[in-house]
């Protein structure tokens, strides 16, 4: 009866250059327990080589010379006594491509090359990319350990060298970036930047790299309020904004953070649980009223903290003028001017373009001012008759603008009575 030599091994296996592969294998050979028990030696050879002379690619026989080019990379895995001939191939090289056969030897009775079941190995170009592992999310200011590893690689062959590149690494010592692991303390400005891990097998031309975009979680650092695309100046968490009464106002609050903070507007300086007047970063007032003068707060709420800024809104108006109007009264010509403005304006009277300041020392005129609500009133009393036609003007102004009005007093009748002075405005 023919001795039974059998081998179970896949016909072909493909591995990328620089990576590892485990080829499962089992074998059987004729052996009787009453035989003497010389050691069982197994070998993997390159196809086309004569087992008696060739250097082996892998063996458990310490007396057999192993090919220098496969030394340490091709290894028998598993227990040969249990008829396991599994072959581990590490740091695969293009020149490893080819066929291999298995051989068993035990004493003088068992010597056999399994030429019918060859293993065909194909080494292809490396397309596998390394994996960059870290606990997400990256948090600004919190040190995080990152590691770079290549799926399918193993310890076999020359060591792997690593290099890390990216803006987030700029302050690191170059030595740190040559390890498979590094500790990174991300900053807000590192969000969205690229981090690359490149792997190279020492002494080989095989390199592969993976680039990841950093997703750095960070709380808002600053809040900016924009009006018509222009940022308002902020001093000590407060911004001052003068607004023309009656004008429409649209403000945009921006607080860069990741993930985006929840932005809301509040009236005044709110308590933490206050109800917002806007649940977005936009505050819209259709017509600003003087009653809205005071404060608004923009709050940026984020899982990592919150930030808020106070907007001091001052409502202003240009002076509005009623007058002047003049009439004869007992003490002389009495002219009145009414005006309103925010902030309260200054006012002056002019007679024939000459300013009338305070009260005349000679008693020729007298100025009185009073205010009621938003309106302020000023009166001018001119003593004596009119010698000729007169132009009386009143002017109101504040930092935002001015308005003036004038009346032309015509010398017509000598006795005008107490009526309104005919005037040409």
């Amino acid at each position: 009866e023919k001795p039974v030599y059998e081998l179970q091994v896949q016909k072909s296996v493909t591995v990328q250059e620089g990576l590892c592969v485990l080829v499962p294998c089992s074998f059987s050979y004729p052996w009787r327990s009453w035989y003497s028990s010389p050691p069982l030696y197994v070998y993997w050879f390159r196809d086309g080589e004569i087992p008696y002379y060739a250097e082996v690619v892998a063996t458990n026989n310490p007396d057999r010379r192993v090919k220098p080019e496969t030394q340490g990379r091709f290894r028998l895995l598993g227990d040969v006594q249990k008829k396991n001939c599994s072959l581990s191939i590490g740091d695969a090289r293009m020149e490893d491509t080819g066929s291999y056969f298995f051989r068993v030897e035990r004493g003088r009775d068992v010597k056999y090359s399994y030429q019918q079941n060859k293993l065909n190995l194909e080494v292809t170009a490396l397309i596998e990319k390394p994996d960059i592992h870290f606990l997400e999310p990256l948090e600004s200011g919190r040190p995080t350990r990152l590691s770079c590893s290549l799926p399918g690689s193993c310890e076999a062959g020359p060591p792997l060298t690593f290099s890390w590149t990216g803006n987030a690494l700029s302050p690191l010592d170059p030595e740190t970036t040559r390890s498979s692991e590094l500790t990174l303390t991300p900053r807000p400005e590192d969000h969205g930047t690229n981090l690359t891990c490149q792997m190279k097998r020492q002494g080989a031309q095989v390199t592969t790299e993976r680039t990841v975009q950093l997703n750095v979680s960070y709380a808002p650092q600053t809040i900016t309020i924009f009006r018509n695309g222009i940022a308002l100046e902020i001093l000590q968490n407060t911004s001052y904004l003068p607004v023309l009464e009656g004008q429409a106002l649209r403000l945009l609050c921006d607080a860069p953070s990741n993930p985006p903070a929840h932005l809301s507007w509040f009236q005044g300086s709110p308590a933490l649980n206050a109800t917002p007047i806007s649940n977005t970063g936009i505050l819209e007032l259709r017509r600003v009223r003087s009653a809205e003068e005071g404060g608004f707060t923009c709050r940026a709420q984020h899982p990592l903290g919150f930030l808020q800024i106070f907007l001091n809104l001052s409502v202003y108006s240009l002076p509005q003028l009623l007058g002047p109007s003049c009439s004869w009264e007992a003490e002389g010509l009495h002219c009145r001017c009414s005006f309103r403005a925010r902030p309260a304006p200054s006012l002056c009277w002019r007679l024939e373009e000459k300013p009338l300041e305070g009260n005349s020392s000679q008693g020729s005129f007298k100025v009185n001012s009073s205010s009621a609500g938003p309106w302020a009133n000023s009166s001018l009393i001119l003593h004596g008759g009119l010698s000729s036609d007169l132009k009386v003007s009143c002017k109101a102004w504040n930092i935002y603008g001015s308005q003036s009005g004038s009346v032309l007093l015509l010398q017509g009748r000598s006795n005008l009575g107490t009526g309104v002075v005919p005037a040409a405005l």
């Epitope: 086309g48 008696y52 003088r108 010597k111």
Partner: antibody
Framework: QVQLQQSGGGLVKPGTSVKLSCKAS????????IHWVKQRSGQGLEWIGW????????KYNEKFKDKATLTADKSSSTVYMELSRLTSEDSAVYFC????????????WGQGTSVTVSS | LMTQTPLSLPVSLGDQASISCRCS???????????LEWYLQKPGQSPKLLIY???NRFSGVPDRFSGSGSGTDFTLKISRVEAEDLGVYYC?????????FGGGTKLEIK
């Protein structure tokens, strides 16, 4: 028990060819390298070449490259050596020998077969 | 080229015999082994393997046979010659093609 049984040879005419056989038994045919060795009467031994059925590998001594052709028939576990264009120089005893194992030695020999070239 | 000396070695039974074999070049194979063998051919018989890889006795070979040497110089020693040891001894190198035998040394009774 490994055995190499030789046959063929005898008296042959000059210019003709002869095919010698070496039938192997007692082992797996593909596991041995079969060598052929020439010994002229009263002379020393000369290595002609080998045939390895495991991978059909054949090696010749350059001196015999145009003289000897080694072949095999796996089904009958036989290795053949054909000697062509025979001359009296080819008259000799031809041995086949089996070489198995890493030890690299011809551990089993056939009994030899004699070739006499004469008209 | 394998040069064997002496060509003939007359000995008395029980004596020690020593045969030398010199190679024209190193016979270390590329795999690191030195395939130097010694064969004995008795009259009318096929050669028989005695020593393989310089110093290893083949199975069934008595321990009075020993081999030594390295590189290019090798020696076969028979510590106490017995009648069955008589015949022609050949050294052989199987490291480089063409494989070659030495010229032979005839061990005979004095």
């Amino acid at each position: 028990q490994v055995q190499l049984q030789q046959s063929g040879g005898g008296l042959v005419k000059p210019g003709t060819s002869v095919k010698l056989s070496c039938k192997a038994s007692g082992y797996i045919f593909t596991e041995y390298i079969i060598h052929w060795v020439k010994q002229r009467s009263g002379q020393g031994l000369e290595w002609i070449g080998w045939f390895y059925p495991g991978i059909i590998s054949i090696k010749y001594n350059e001196k015999f490259k145009d003289k000897a052709t080694l072949t095999a028939d796996k089904s009958s576990s036989t290795v053949y050596m054909e000697l062509s264009r025979l001359t009296s120089e080819d008259s000799a005893v031809y041995f086949c020998a089996g070489h198995e194992g890493y030890d690299g030695a011809m551990d089993y020999w056939g009994q030899g077969t004699s070739v006499t070239v004469s008209s | 080229l394998m040069t064997q000396t002496p060509l003939s070695l007359p000995v008395s039974l029980g004596d020690q015999a020593s045969i030398s074999c010199r190679c024209s070049q190193s016979i270390v194979h590329s795999n690191g082994n030195t395939y130097l063998e010694w064969y004995l051919q008795k009259p009318g018989q096929s050669p028989k393997l005695l020593i393989y890889r310089v110093s290893n006795r083949f199975s069934g070979v008595p321990d009075r046979f020993s081999g030594s040497g390295s590189g290019t110089d090798f020696t076969l020693k028979i510590s106490r010659v017995e009648a069955e040891d008589l015949g022609v001894y050949y050294c052989f190198q199987g490291s480089h093609v063409p494989w070659t035998f030495g010229g032979g040394t005839k061990l005979e009774i004095k």
